[in-house]
């Protein structure tokens, strides 16, 4: 008596495809696909493609992630980016002659525009493009804390590289903190790791958009690559929906 | 036409219990339960209970871990501990007057006794018992690298505490490296985090078994709590079995 | 591991990750996702034989636990183990949006 | 989350983690594990209704994806999500051994 069952691969694939159709719409909280009637003709805007590519690169660099996901994490996250306050801003004045660190300031109101409420933020990454370098250096990241104090956030050992490379730091907690405070300018400090007995505390890493050699015609390209915050957040309207359906479970 | 099926909870439980019976034996690579004929009478030895408790505490402190596990990780890991070389050893002489760090040395031959081959090691943790403290301090851990150079391993922000507390650092890679080298004395340095502009670089953290106030009668208790390596490794005989069945997949 | 490296290059009958590329336009009839044009969704398929503690050849049964029922389930099932997210670009009205969808790509499977 | 907090305090019919305490002596007839005497193994049980894209009340169906078929499986299954290890003490001959068994305790379940 055989208990073998032949699996209908085509049926399984069809069911999987149908399930994916529902999955994508449900993750976006859409009852049906959005109409394309208003989509402007022509290719996607440059900035949108850059943002998509940043996100795609992040995915490729991530290990596969089978972690238990809270309900809110099931739903899609909108991705936006907030560029660092331009280097010509007066706020950078007093940081000019410090050799062990570089500074990056952000306008909280720009962040709040992308993420209106702190709980909506699911991830924030500080992205810096490091220029090619022949030296190894241990670097640290700090958050501006009060007038002249800095809070340690993390570190990285940077090995020599022949090509520019993106560095990414998880700063979700910091950005959520900024959103909980009033508007204003907030910042990060990227420093050489100064050990207790080391004498040479100079930062040997050059960061795109911060290093002084800026050629005029490369301005906008350079600008696209200056340090930025990559934000992932639940859109407000999706969050309200989520909040109101909490009673289900 | 109803397609409801009543679930026989008792049958499900029975099947789960049977599966667990097989699971435990298979994780230990035992074809049958070990005979208890030679088990000495009386309670478990103190040292074994201490080791069991260390492991159990580690589990409780860990978040649930649904990560994909490589085949080797399916099987049970034997847990052992290797105590730090005694403080009276001459090796500590030249580290006595350094205020920014404390030093812990280990005998590689003791480690090799517990883990005969580097690939068998699945996890190594450096465990330190920090005494109660009213100050917050940012600390760093380094590995002895060559004669007088140290390699950065990690850091921790230690907040004030009213009770002694165990600190744990994952040092799997380091211990695996030591096992790949010859026998000898290897070590860790536990330091204050010295920032580029900070003046006070003193380590304010007291570690049990290292701090000087050692009262005679508390020697052995103190000894149990001196820094140690908690090692998790596949027993050699189980590993050989695993190796020979590799061809299956 | 029952991952794409092993499963795509073998004829494994038991639980394994299977290839499935979804073309948004062709398979779902959707033109509204502007990037990417499709993605390797994949799926898990194949039996996870339930191993009761049969006394015959018990040691052989035990060796199979790791593959067929590592979680000692009462009825093990072939399910995704490692998953990856998928970023997409689409428009809401005139506004382009970049969103990341979690757990969309199956990289490996397991009996659970 | 379909974890012990939620499932042990509700009468959820669908996929949930169910209570199961294993007493090594009573349930398995084993005296050879010296510590612990038993442990909360738990298990996953309950249907994960497959949600085909039923056109009726589609928006209601979509709201259920997160619960019943978050991975968009062709046949979703109730399986462990978060697992914890179990340390044990036993003797081999006269030698006591402390070993850690991975993924022994089911803390939460999911439809996968």
């Amino acid at each position: 008596l055989s208990t073998c069952k032949t699996i209908d691969m085509e049926l399984v694939k069809r069911k999987r495809i149908e399930a994916i159709r529902g999955q994508i719409l449900s993750k976006l909280r859409l009852a049906s696909p959005p109409s394309q009637g208003e989509v402007p003709p022509g290719p996607l805007p440059e900035a949108v493609l850059a943002l998509y590519n940043s996100t795609r690169d992040r995915v490729a660099g991530e290990s596969a992630d089978p972690e238990p996901e809270p309900e809110a994490d099931y739903y899609a996250k909108e991705v936006t980016r907030v560029l660092m306050v331009d280097r010509n801003n007066a706020i950078y004045e007093k940081t000019k002659d410090i050799s062990h660190s570089i500074y990056m300031f952000f306008n909280t109101s720009d962040i709040r525009e992308a993420v209106p409420e702190p709980p909506l933020l699911s991830r924030a990454e500080l992205r810096l493009q490091r220029l090619k370098s022949s030296v190894e250096q241990h670097v640290e990241l700090y958050q501006k804390y009060s007038n002249n104090s800095w809070r340690y956030l993390g570190n990285r050992l940077l090995t020599p590289t022949d090509t520019p490379e993106w560095l990414s730091f998880d700063v979700t907690g910091v950005v959520r903190q900024w959103l909980n405070q009033g508007d204003g300018i907030q910042g990060f400090r990227f420093s050489a790791h100064c050990s207790c007995d080391s004498k040479d505390n100079k930062l040997h890493v050059e960061i795109n958009g911060i290093s002084p050699k800026r050629r005029g015609d490369l301005g906008t390209i350079h600008d696209m690559n200056r340090p930025f915050l990559l934000l992932m957040a639940t859109p407000l309207e999706r969050a309200q929906h989520l909040h109101s359906s909490r009673h289900r479970r | 036409l109803s397609t409801c099926k009543t679930i026989d909870m008792e049958l499900v439980k029975r099947k789960r219990i049977e599966a667990i019976r097989g699971q435990i034996l298979s994780k230990l690579r035992l074809a049958s339960p070990p005979s208890q004929g030679e088990v000495p009478p009386g309670p478990l030895p103190e040292a074994v209970l201490a080791l069991y408790n260390s492991t159990r505490d580690r589990v409780a402190g860990e978040s649930a871990d649904p990560e994909p596990e490589p085949e080797a990780d399916y099987y049970a890991k034997e847990v052992t501990r290797v105590l730090m070389v005694d403080r009276n050893n001459a090796i500590y002489e030249k580290t006595k007057d350094i205020s920014h760090s404390i030093y812990m040395f280990f005998n590689t031959s003791d480690i090799r006794e517990a883990v005969p081959e580097p690939p068998l090691l699945s996890r190594a943790e450096l465990r330190l018992q920090r005494l109660k403290s009213s100050v917050e301090q940012h600390v760093e851990l380094y590995q002895k690298y060559s004669n007088n150079s140290w390699r950065y391993l990690g850091n921790r922000l230690l907040t004030p505490t009213d009770t002694p507390e165990w600190l744990s650092f994952d040092v799997t890679g380091v211990v695996r490296q030591w096992l790949n080298q010859g026998d000898g004395i290897q070590g860790f340095r536990f330091s204050a985090h010295c920032s580029c502009d900070s003046k006070d670089n003193k380590l304010h953290v007291e570690i049990n078994g290292i701090s000087p106030k050692r009262r005679g009668d508390l020697g052995t208790i103190h000894d149990m709590n001196r820094p140690f390596l908690l090692l998790m490794a596949t027993p050699l005989e189980r590993a050989q079995h695993l190796h020979s069945s590799r061809h299956r997949r | 591991a029952l991952d794409t490296n092993y499963c795509f290059s073998s004829t494994e009958k038991n639980c394994c990750v299977r290839q499935l590329y979804i073309d948004f336009r062709k398979d779902l009839g959707w033109k509204w996702i502007h990037e990417p044009k499709g993605y390797h969704a994949n799926f898990c398929l194949g039996p996870c034989p339930y191993i009761w503690s049969l006394d015959t050849q018990y040691s052989k049964v035990l060796a199979l636990y790791n593959q067929h029922n590592p979680g000692a389930s009462a009825s093990p099932c072939c399910v995704p183990q490692a998953l990856e997210p998928l970023p997409i670009v689409y428009y809401v009205g005139r506004k382009p949006k970049v969103e990341q969808l979690s757990n969309m790509i199956v990289r490996s499977c397991k009996c659970s | 989350a379909l974890d012990t907090n939620y499932c042990f305090s509700s009468t959820e019919k669908n996929c949930c983690v169910r209570q199961l305490y294993i007493d090594f002596r009573k349930d398995l007839g084993w005296k050879w594990i010296h510590e612990p005497k038993g442990y909360h193994a738990n298990f996953c049980l309950g249907p994960c209704p497959y949600i085909w894209s039923l056109d009726t009340q589609y928006s209601k169906v979509l709201a259920l994806y997160n619960q019943h078929n978050p991975g968009a499986s062709a046949s979703p299954c109730c399986v462990p999500q978060a697992l914890e290890p179990l340390p044990i003490v036993y003797y081999v001959g006269r030698k006591p051994k402390v070993e850690q068994l991975s993924n022994m305790i089911v803390r939460s379940c999911k439809c996968s």
């Epitope: 859409l30 009852a31 049906s32 696909p33 959005p34 109409s35 394309q36 009637g37 208003e38 309207e237 309200q240 | - | 009839g29 033109k31 809401v92 009205g93 005139r94 506004k95 | 056109d55």
Partner: antibody, heavy 120, light 107 residues
């Protein structure tokens, strides 16, 4: 409960102007596009235009038949939608509906309508 | 502009009947086809969106199907409350356009 109530209809002479209003309740007004649709007596429905939501900057879109003569606006603080109609013609006589528009290309809730008659 | 054509302007049926109303687009509208019901008092309600999705609160005796340029609305087990005019509308390309309507009467 989503509710849309139009008002302001009546009799107007050709060449004249009139403003219609639509009071919305039961939903977050700024999240939605709002639209005007009309139906001449015994004829089909005709889409006139919409005003977009907050994320889309409250910009407007019109059908060719009313572009330049009709203006859609909104008062978000009061949740009111307006249709300002100028240089009215006899063929503008119709029942005017305000409707909530969704990104899916459909109108999910409609008002009861208000009637405009353009006649001398 | 995309033209929407409902060839049957009026339809007569008996209570309990199953009937189908059709709608054709002048070009492929990728399933962005919606159906509305207008009662004799002028009240308009959405019934079905994106070809076959039932709007909340709409009885399941209403269903929709179709693809490309041809679409239909089916009412099974006709009730007195279903007496109305039914309009189709495309949401694929601006400007949104409606069909001429199909008026349903009881025999």
């Amino acid at each position: 409960e989503v509710k849309l109530v139009e008002s302001g209809g009546g009799l107007v002479q050709p060449g004249g102007s009139l403003s219609l209003s639509c009071a919305a309740s039961g939903f977050t007004f700024t999240d939605y596009y709002m639209s005007w649709v009309r139906q001449p007596p015994g004829k089909a429905l005709e889409w006139l235009g919409f005003i977009r939501n907050k994320p889309n900057g409250y910009t407007t879109e019109y059908s060719a038949s009313v572009k330049g003569r009709f203006t859609i606006s909104r008062d978000n603080s009061q949740s009111i939608l307006y249709l300002q109609m100028n240089v009215l013609r006899a063929e503008d006589s119709a029942t005017y509906y305000c409707a909530r528009y969704t990104g899916g290309g459909y109108f999910d809730y409609w008002g009861q309508g208000t009637t405009l008659t353009v006649s001398s | 502009d995309i033209q929407m054509t409902q060839t049957t302007s009026s339809l007569s049926a008996s209570l309990g009947d199953r009937l189908t109303i059709s709608c054709r687009a002048s070009q492929d509208i990728s399933n962005y086809l919606n159906w509305y019901q207008q009662k004799p008092d002028g009240t308009v309600k959405l019934l079905i969106y994106y070809t076959s999705r039932l709007h909340s609160g709409v009885p399941s005796r209403f269903s929709g199907s179709g693809s490309g340029t041809d679409y239909s609305l089916t009412i099974s087990n006709l009730e007195q409350a279903d007496i109305a005019t039914y309009f189709c509308q495309q949401g694929d390309t601006l400007p949104w356009t409606f069909g001429g309507g199909t008026k349903l009467e009881i025999k």
